[in-house]
């Protein structure tokens, strides 16, 4: 439960974070679990502890193993484990699965690829980026802070991306590389003139006097996240809040349900204790977005209770 997997390549820097968190002023002790040997804090050592962090500068295959960190707080000690594996560098271009960080997906609108674990290191821009071992060149690729931005993403941009940067520790430089897969989602979002799915235009809704009634206004506005979209009810052309009848309230239903990939909104009109005068009102379901406004009108009619004869 309190264990985290970390991996790196021999002769590169690797910095590992203790899985237990605490306040900056808490002392953190590190041990090599197999021998219970304390990890030194002096920076002259190749492997040393620095608070929440354990640093391998640089890492060696023999460093592989489980490391214990103990965060010492005023009332109890919290123990965590870092499972560290250091791999030999591959001679060929393929990055094996065990060296891959989590896959990220992007689309035409959002194509940021973050360099994994970089926040742990003392690095300076620019980052170098590679795709399938080839250095990325061209105006479509922009290394920005700790991420890569790809303009006009296409399906061919899917693949394994490696970031390479230099970690600086007391004037000494160490190389770090990290690789993750990038997949491209075909997320062509669009916006349409609102389509009201319910109620039907000029629908007659049967209600029972004295009972509660619900009317649902449901509309779709296109695909993907919508910049501006709303559904609401009006009574005789007046907003519900301005109409001033506390028995009649509206509340949001499914807030943005992507059924069939469509962005839809629901608004439920709740009428408590239906009265005769409610049958005289005009109920308008309104759906609006940047394209315009669509309105469907509903009227209420009395539903005669069914007589039960023995």
């Amino acid at each position: 439960k309190f264990s985290k997997q970390s991996w790196g390549l021999e002769n590169e820097a690797l910095i590992v974070r203790c899985p237990r968190q605490g306040k900056p002023s808490y002392t953190v002790d590190w041990y090599y679990s197999q021998t219970n040997k304390s990890i030194p804090t002096q920076e002259r050592n190749r492997v040393f502890a620095s608070g929440q962090l354990l640093k391998f500068l640089p890492a060696a295959v023999a460093d592989s193993g489980i490391y214990t960190c103990i965060v010492r707080s005023p009332t109890f000690n919290r123990t965590g484990y870092a499972n560290v594996t250091i791999y030999k560098k591959q001679s060929d271009c393929n990055v094996p699965d065990y060296l891959m960080y989590s896959t990220v997906s992007g689309s035409e609108k959002n194509s940021k690829i973050y360099c994994p674990t970089i926040d742990l290191y003392n690095w300076t821009a620019p980052l170098e980026w590679f795709k399938n071992c080839q250095a990325l060149q061209g105006s479509r690729y922009r290394a920005h802070k700790s991420f890569l931005v790809i303009d006009n993403v296409m399906t061919e941009d899917a693949g394994d991306y490696t970031c390479k940067f230099i970690h600086n520790e007391n004037g000494a430089n160490y190389s770090v590389t990290a690789t993750r897969s990038f997949t491209v989602k075909d997320e062509q979002g669009f916006s349409l003139f609102p389509v009201i799915g319910a109620p039907a235009q000029n629908e007659i809704k049967e209600v029972e006097i004295g009972k509660n009634a619900n009317l649902t206004c449901s509309a779709c506005f296109g695909k993907g996240t919508q910049f501006l979209a709303a559904v609401l009810w009006q009574l005789n052309g007046t907003k519900i809040t301005d109409f001033g009848e506390p028995r009649i309230q509206q509340e949001e239903g499914q807030n943005q349900s992507f059924s069939n990939g469509l962005a839809c909104l629901d608004m439920v009109l709740r009428i408590a204790d239906v009265k005769e005068e409610d049958l005289l009102l005009q109920y308008d379901c309104l759906a609006l977005n940047l394209h315009g406004l669509r309105r469907h009108t509903v009227r209420l009619s009395r539903k005669n209770p069914i007589d039960h004869h023995s």
Partner: antibody, heavy 116, light 113 residues
Framework: QVQLVQSGAEVKKPGASVKVSCKAS????????MNWVRQAPGQRLEWMGW????????TYGDNFKGRVTITRDTSASTAYMELSSLRSEDTAVYYC?????????WGQGTLVTVSS | DIVMTQSPDSLAVSLGERATINCKSS????????????LAWYQQKPGQPPKLLIY???TRESGVPDRFSGSGSGTDFTLTISSLQAEDLAVYYC?????????FGGGTKVEIK
């Protein structure tokens, strides 16, 4: 700059649940735990619990155990607090606050009103 | 649980005068492991979240004016505003930052005399 942005006000009926979100920006989310604190009208601040954002391990205050669930989504740099079986005395402003020496960074607060 | 008791409940002070708020904890907030007192002070204005003023009983948070100071150790702590300004009108809270559950004092309302 560090920012914690919380979800909007909620009105709930007794017995219902509420889930409040807290989106962090301006720092590395998994480097710091996230606390949840509430303040009922005219009452003192009350710590509800915190979550280790790195491994997702929550710790709850005794007063809330069994009713509160604190989670996080590292990909969205967001922490969540869900409180169930709401009662009128849960009407309060709920805050997220980043762990540190004291709580230097707070969300703007989310008013949860429990009313029948 | 550690109980935090603040006094007074409210305090009326003239502008430019000194304001002193006390806070007592039911258990020591001193951690012998690093000799830190885990006590924090906050200022809260209406409609706003609390703002951290002091942590570690006496360390001022960056950006906090130096008229705010904290002192004390173990179970007895004090927040002092050396020369009260109009913008200091607020409720002040102390907090046990030592052990779970983190607990807060009942607050002290500072007003202008």
């Amino acid at each position: 700059q560090v920012q914690l942005v919380q979800s909007g006000a909620e009105v709930k009926k007794p017995g219902a649940s509420v889930k409040v979100s807290c989106k962090a920006s301006g720092y590395t989310f998994i480097n710091y735990g996230m606390n949840w604190v509430r303040q009922a009208p005219g009452q003192r601040l009350e710590w509800m619990g915190w979550i280790n954002t790195y491994i997702g391990e929550p710790t709850y205050g005794d007063n809330f155990k069994g009713r509160v669930t604190i989670t996080r989504d590292t990909s969205a740099s967001t922490a969540y607090m869900e409180l169930s079986s709401l009662r009128s005395e849960d009407t309060a402003v709920y805050y997220c606050a980043r762990e540190g020496e004291g709580f230097a960074y707070w969300g703007q607060g989310t008013l949860v009103t429990v009313s029948s | 649980d550690i109980v935090m008791t603040q006094s007074p409940d409210s305090l009326a002070v003239s502008l430019g005068e000194r304001a002193t708020i006390n806070c007592k904890s039911s258990q020591s907030l001193l951690y012998s492991g690093n000799q830190n007192n885990y006590l924090a002070w906050y200022q809260q204005k209406p409609g706003q979240p609390p703002k951290l003023l002091i942590y570690g009983a006496s360390t001022r948070e960056s950006g906090v004016p130096d008229r705010f100071s904290g002192s004390g150790s173990g179970t007895d702590f004090t927040l002092t505003i050396s020369s009260l300004q109009a913008e200091d009108l607020a409720v002040y809270y102390c907090q046990n930052d030592h052990s779970y559950p983190y607990t807060f004092g009942g607050g002290t309302k500072v007003e202008i005399k």
